[in-house]
């Protein structure tokens, strides 16, 4: 029977004739930076080439006994998970291994840096097809390691890393915290986060998605035909490296941004029990378990978007938080969130020639998050239109006035300290969906984009009684680009996108002691691209 992990990443209604890239990843080379490996294991022999690269520290302890099978254990297993004949994800992928971890599984930042440089030089000397680099290791936060990952990613290499097994915020570790790297957490057969002794998978906003990482059968370095189960975020990352190899083999021209968006899009959504994560991390941690796409066709026409959370601003009065999209992505909307509800909104602003999303803390607030909605929108021309606070009691409003530009997101930002309470509701005039409205004391920012065939519509869901959470989702075929709250009398903590659903959170009714705070309305902006749809039809 198929191992649970391979079954899990195989989408429902999967048909062999429908998704078969040439030999399951054969056009892709996967570099593995790990321990030494047993390359003559029949699961991987002929598929893994051991490079002459080795940069490892001495093993600790005077009585350490270097046993080949133990030295090779971690790397051999991971090579098997990526491309093993029987238990591998991408059975056609070829691999190259670099030894950066010693027999105790320890390495150094410098060793890993030199390994990454070795790959970069190899790529320059002998350019091949798409490259995936698997980094199944985690150490303390390292600015220099993250920078090296960024350089390699910008050279067109896909880097996949383990989130770490410390039951902690992945942003505290490297290379997991590098934004350019695809960071993978681990789940088990029940789609629950993996517990490893007293610890377990890392979590948080630096994790891109989860993948099977408990009781994973793979090649064992004990013998040429041995298999063993291992667990951890390394195994999870190996699954995603395999999936990436499959996707890149089917579509070799995919950019890192496109690949990441597809990994997110085709993941199983909302299957992880978030109660395992610390309460403050639940909203930040993606509820996504990696899966292979059901088909190589039909993905190209979709408008792909993902949600990017900033780091926490910190509690100081003027603190801000910034969320950024990847270089190839467009920022289509910006929202903010504060657990205390004390915030001064958010705005989209230019920084280094690119739009970023900045959220503002308020006096007495415990800090804010900025939430960017980052999308793949080829040939897009986006700009931000701002309306300063209005004098009129009707409130502030702004719309996209340029011909062919459509509204993709609304943000509001205010200077007054606490704009969430005791303000009269503002009603959107009917028949004017292409505009943003807000409090008269607030500046309103509209994200307006022109792209071939782009069309958007506004969808609202209002609840008259106070609710902790109000949601509105885009229907099939449409992608959520913007998520905000219509100004009302209820105290809104913020708004954010979860997959294709806009979530507006309000202060817990039980803590306010009042049940007459009024309506909460979630506003979703849903878009689609007719141009992308037509382009994909022409290709087939």
């Amino acid at each position: 029977s198929i191992p649970w992990n391979l079954e899990r990443i195989t989408p429902p209604r999967y048909r062999a004739d429908e998704y078969q890239p040439p030999d399951g990843g054969s056009l892709v080379e996967v570099y593995l930076l790990d321990t030494s490996i047993q390359s003559d294991h029949r699961e991987i022999e002929g598929r893994v080439m051991v490079t002459d690269f080795e940069n490892v520290p001495e093993e600790d302890g005077t009585r350490f006994h270097r046993q080949a099978s133990k030295c090779d254990s971690h790397g051999t297993h991971l090579a098997g998970v990526v491309s093993g004949r029987d238990a591998g994800v991408a059975k056609g992928a070829s691999m190259r291994s670099l030894r950066v971890l010693n027999c105790q599984g320890k390495g150094t930042v410098s060793g890993t840096l030199i390994g990454l440089e070795f790959i970069r030089k190899s790529q320059l000397v002998q350019p091949v097809g798409p490259l995936v680099v698997l980094l199944p290791l985690a150490g303390g936060y390292s600015r220099v390691l993250n920078a090296a990952c960024q350089r390699l990613a910008r050279a067109g290499v896909v880097l996949v890393t383990a989130a770490g097994n410390f039951r902690d915020d992945a942003c505290l570790y490297s290379p997991a915290s590098a934004p350019e790297v695809i960071t993978v957490g681990a789940t088990n057969a029940q789609d629950q986060p993996v517990t490893l002794g007293t610890l377990g998978t890392n979590f948080g906003r630096c994790v891109d998605l989860f993948a099977p990482g408990e009781d994973i059968i793979g090649a064992s370095s004990d013998c040429s035909t041995c298999f063993v189960s291992q667990s951890g975020t390394s195994q999870a990352a190996a699954h995603v490296a395999g999936i990436a190899a499959m996707m890149l083999s089917a579509e070799p021209e995919l950019t890192l941004a496109e690949l990441r968006q597809r990994l997110i899009h085709f993941s199983a959504k909302d299957v992880i029990n978030e109660a395992w994560f610390p309460e403050d991390q639940r909203v930040l941690t993606p509820n996504l378990v990696a899966a292979l796409p059901p088909s190589t066709h039909g993905a190209g026409w979709q408008l792909f978007c993902r949600t990017v959370w900033s780091a926490h601003s910190g509690p100081t009065r003027m603190a801000t938080a910034v969320a950024r999209c990847a270089p190839d992505e467009e920022l289509l909307s910006c929202s903010s969130f504060s657990r205390s509800g004390k915030r001064r909104g958010e705005r989209m602003e230019a920084q280094g020639g690119k739009l970023v999303c900045r959220a503002h803390n308020a006096f007495g607030g415990e800090g804010v998050y900025a939430i960017a909605r980052c999308c793949l929108l080829p040939q897009a021309n986006c700009s931000v239109h701002t309306a300063p606070p209005a004098e009129a009691s009707m409130g502030t409003r702004v719309h996209c006035h340029q011909q062919g530009h459509v509204l993709t997101g609304c943000s509001s930002h205010w200077e007054v300290e606490d704009l969430g309470t005791h303000k009269p509701p503002v009603l959107r005039p009917r028949g004017q969906p292409n505009q943003c409205v807000g409090h008269r004391e607030a500046s309103i920012h509209a994200s307006c984009c022109h792209a071939p065939g782009l069309e958007c519509k506004v969808k609202e869901h209002g609840i008259p009684a106070p609710q902790e959470q109000v949601t509105v989702a885009c229907e099939e075929g449409w992608t959520l680009t913007g998520c905000s709250a219509l100004p009302g009398t209820s105290h809104v903590l913020g708004a954010y996108a979860v997959d294709n659903t806009c979530v507006v959170r309000s202060r817990d009714v039980s803590t306010t002691g009042s049940t007459s705070e009024g309506a909460v309305t979630a506003v979703a902006i849903c878009c689609r691209s007719r141009h992308l749809a037509q382009a994909s039809q022409e290709l087939q």
Epitope: D23, R42, E43, E45, G46, R47, S69, S73, G84, R85, D86, A87, K91, G92, I217, S220, D222, C223, S224, T225, C226, F227, V228, S229
Partner: antibody, heavy 119, light 113 residues
Framework: QVQLVQSGAEVKKPGESLKISCKGS????????ISWVRQMPGKGLEWMGL????????RYSPNFQGQVTISADKSISTAYLQWSSLKASDTAMYYC????????????WGQGTLVTVSS | DIVMTQSPDSLAVSLGERATINCRSS????????????LAWYQQKPGQPPKLLIY???TRESGVPDRFSGSGSGTDFTLTISSLQAEDVAVYYC?????????FGQGTKVEIK
Amino acid sequence: QVQLVQSGAEVKKPGESLKISCKGSGYSFTDYYISWVRQMPGKGLEWMGLIYPGDSYTRYSPNFQGQVTISADKSISTAYLQWSSLKASDTAMYYCARDHGYRPYSDIWGQGTLVTVSS
Amino acid sequence: DIVMTQSPDSLAVSLGERATINCRSSQSVLYSSNNKNYLAWYQQKPGQPPKLLIYWASTRESGVPDRFSGSGSGTDFTLTISSLQAEDVAVYYCQQYSSFPITFGQGTKVEIK
């Protein structure tokens, strides 16, 4: 049902070439290894080598390396064992058997092909 | 290569009696990472291909009568037929499948006394 069906008995002269076959059915042929095992008259079992039809990976016993060639055609779910120049000492019963990666024992065997090499 | 040695070479047992075959490997076929012995037992009747009886040293293949049992670990293994039946007359082979080349014992012939 799962089975391996081997080609019929062969009588050959020394120096001739030969290719015998083993066709799998009732299972995913590319997901299992096929081993070839020799049994000389009145003797025990000797493992010759294997192939993984999924990617044609082969592994030979040192005793048979260079003496025989193992191949497969996954499009027709068939594995082959061939000799370019037979010797009288190649007279034996040849079995194919399948095994799985993490279940590396041979659970299904072909009925055998008797090869007789005689001048 | 791992050398597999069976004893005895042949064995004559009365119907209904116990038959015991031993197999020794020149090196351990027990692996600590998964705690499995990479050893199988096969039965070959005259004019037939071998048939899998036992794998992982002690796991009976489905459809094999429960009078067949395997035991042992590391380098020493035993196949036991608890109550010999007429249809059990055959040659029995042990096999290690952990290391290449895969190797078989020389075989033990079981007959009825």
